[in-house]
């Protein structure tokens, strides 16, 4: 709990806490945190963890708290909670946090990772699926194919992470991706490393040819060596009785 | 610079009414309340009430109430303060001032008020 | 409403002195508490806010304390544009209340 006044949960409720237009924004936007109570309050505070006095505190009469926060910076980026007071309760009490809103104030969203599912190596006629994986929820994943200047597949996803299923003929490839806020206005992430998908192994493939080959000659002497052994054994037994080897 | 012009000093007659304005500059003006302070010759200060220009909500001090009416013009940034039923104990310098989010005031420069027959 | 007793009411001082102003509320206030400078003829001007936050462009020589219901004013050392006027302004409840006010004079 965030003051050690706080009642019970069911006595004082704890308000909601929401951000326009995003809870990730660039430098520079006008962010309004919106902190809405279950019944009229007098006052909203928002709280960043461990504070047991509110950072930015607004007076209303009603059940909602608007913050204006005018061109934020990163710095005023971070963990949130909003509570309440109203003038009938005891000096310093105040509601039940909201649940905690992250605000993330950035440039640019941390690059995110891209592997294949099972594995880079497509096997004839098998599909694969691509995992773009970055660190937020709710964000819109974009997946690109080299050579391709225009986006190969989207996806919004509520995890931090979107799959992008290929069809196995058309999935060798080099393929990058991002992620980027839903909504304006846009953050975007850097582009992941590159991953390259191709057919099993050529190479290997030889390999495998080759081998059978090998092994269908090793076969055939084999044949060729038996059918003589028998062809000899069998004339030794048909020759005159006196003459032996 | 976040600046409060107020309306420049008043003589009004007992009964009459008035109107006192404090145009906001500096900062978005409906991003923040806006407070209304009394100050009677050579005495301390008293709070009358605010208006969040955002939704024209306010709040008054109970000793206030009925006396001073809060209102906002948004396209002008501007509050008004309107006192009715004038009498000598109303005679006093009446202050504007900007609460932020951290617990900053800022002051306008006051407007006086002189209730005279 | 929450009563706001400042003390003193008055006081001289000495260019240079340190010099220490209280206001004790009726109740707590969880340290929303100004302090606040007038002088002759002009409007208040806030130097401290939350107990114990300078105001942008304030002396350093000007300093908050306290919590609860009991806080502090000091100037560590007067000058002569010192002298005016000092409130004390409590904002934890409704209606907000000032405290009678120091008039601090040079000696």
């Known amino acids: 709990d965030i003051t050690p006044s706080v009642p019970p949960a069911s006595y004082h409720p704890k308000p909601w806490l929401g951000a326009q237009p995003a809870t990730v924004v660039t430098p520079g936007v006008n962010v309004t945190l919106r902190c809405r109570a279950p019944q009229p309050a007098w006052r909203f505070g928002l709280f960043k963890p461990g504070e047991i006095a509110p950072l930015l505190f607004r007076d209303v009469s009603s059940e909602l708290a608007e913050f204006f926060l005018e061109e934020v910076t990163p710095a005023q980026g971070g963990s949130y909670r909003c509570c309440y007071r109203r003038p009938d309760w005891g000096p310093g009490v105040w509601s039940q946090p909201s649940d905690v809103l992250e605000l993330l104030v950035t440039e640019e969203l941390p690059r995110p990772s891209l592997v294949a599912l099972p594995g880079p190596v497509v096997g004839p006629g098998a599909n694969v699926s691509l995992r773009c994986a970055g660190r937020l929820r709710n964000m819109s994943f974009v997946l690109y194919r080299e050579g391709v200047a225009a986006p190969l597949q989207y996806r919004h996803s509520a995890q931090p992470w979107a799959d992008f299923t290929l069809l196995g003929a058309r999935a060798p490839g080099t393929y990058s991706c991002y992620y980027h806020t839903p909504s304006a206005p846009y953050v975007l992430s850097q582009r992941s490393e590159v991953l390259v998908i191709s057919w099993e192994d050529s190479g290997s493939s030889d390999y495998t040819r080759g081998n059978l080959v090998r092994l269908g000659l090793a076969g055939l002497v084999l044949i060729s060596l038996g059918a003589l052994v028998t062809f000899d054994w069998r004339s030794q037994n048909r020759a005159p009785a006196g003459i032996r080897p | 610079e976040i600046q409060l012009q107020q309306s420049g000093p008043e003589l009004v007659k007992p009964g009459a009414s008035v109107k006192v304005s404090c145009k906001a500059s500096g900062y978005v003006f409906t991003s923040y309340n806006m407070y209304w302070v009394k100050q009677s010759h050579g005495k301390s200060l008293e709070w009358i009430g605010y208006i969040d220009p955002y939704n024209g909500g306010t709040r008054y001090n109970q000793k206030f109430k009925g006396k001073a009416t809060l209102t906002v013009d948004k396209s002008s940034s501007t509050a008004y303060m309107h006192l009715n039923s004038l009498t000598s104990e109303d005679s006093a310098v009446y202050y504007c001032?900007?609460?932020?989010?951290?617990?900053?005031?800022?002051w306008g420069q006051g407007t006086t008020l002189t209730v005279s027959s | 409403d929450i009563k706001m007793t400042q003390s003193p009411s008055s006081m001289y001082a000495s260019l240079g002195e340190r010099v220490t102003i209280t206001c004790k509320a009726s109740?707590?206030?969880?340290?929303?508490l100004s302090w606040l400078q007038q002088k002759p003829g002009k409007s208040p001007k806030t130097l401290i806010y939350?107990?114990?936050r300078l105001v942008d462009g304030v002396p350093s020589r000007f300093s908050g304390s306290g919590s609860g219901q009991d806080y502090s004013l000091t100037i560590s050392s007067l000058e002569y544009e010192d002298m005016g006027i000092y409130y004390c302004l409590q904002y934890d409840d409704f209606p907000y209340t000032f405290g009678g006010g120091t008039k601090l004079e040079i000696k």
């Open positions: 001032a900007r609460l932020d989010y951290y617990g900053n005031f800022y």
């Open positions: 939350r107990a114990n």
């Open positions: 109740q707590d206030i969880n340290s929303f």
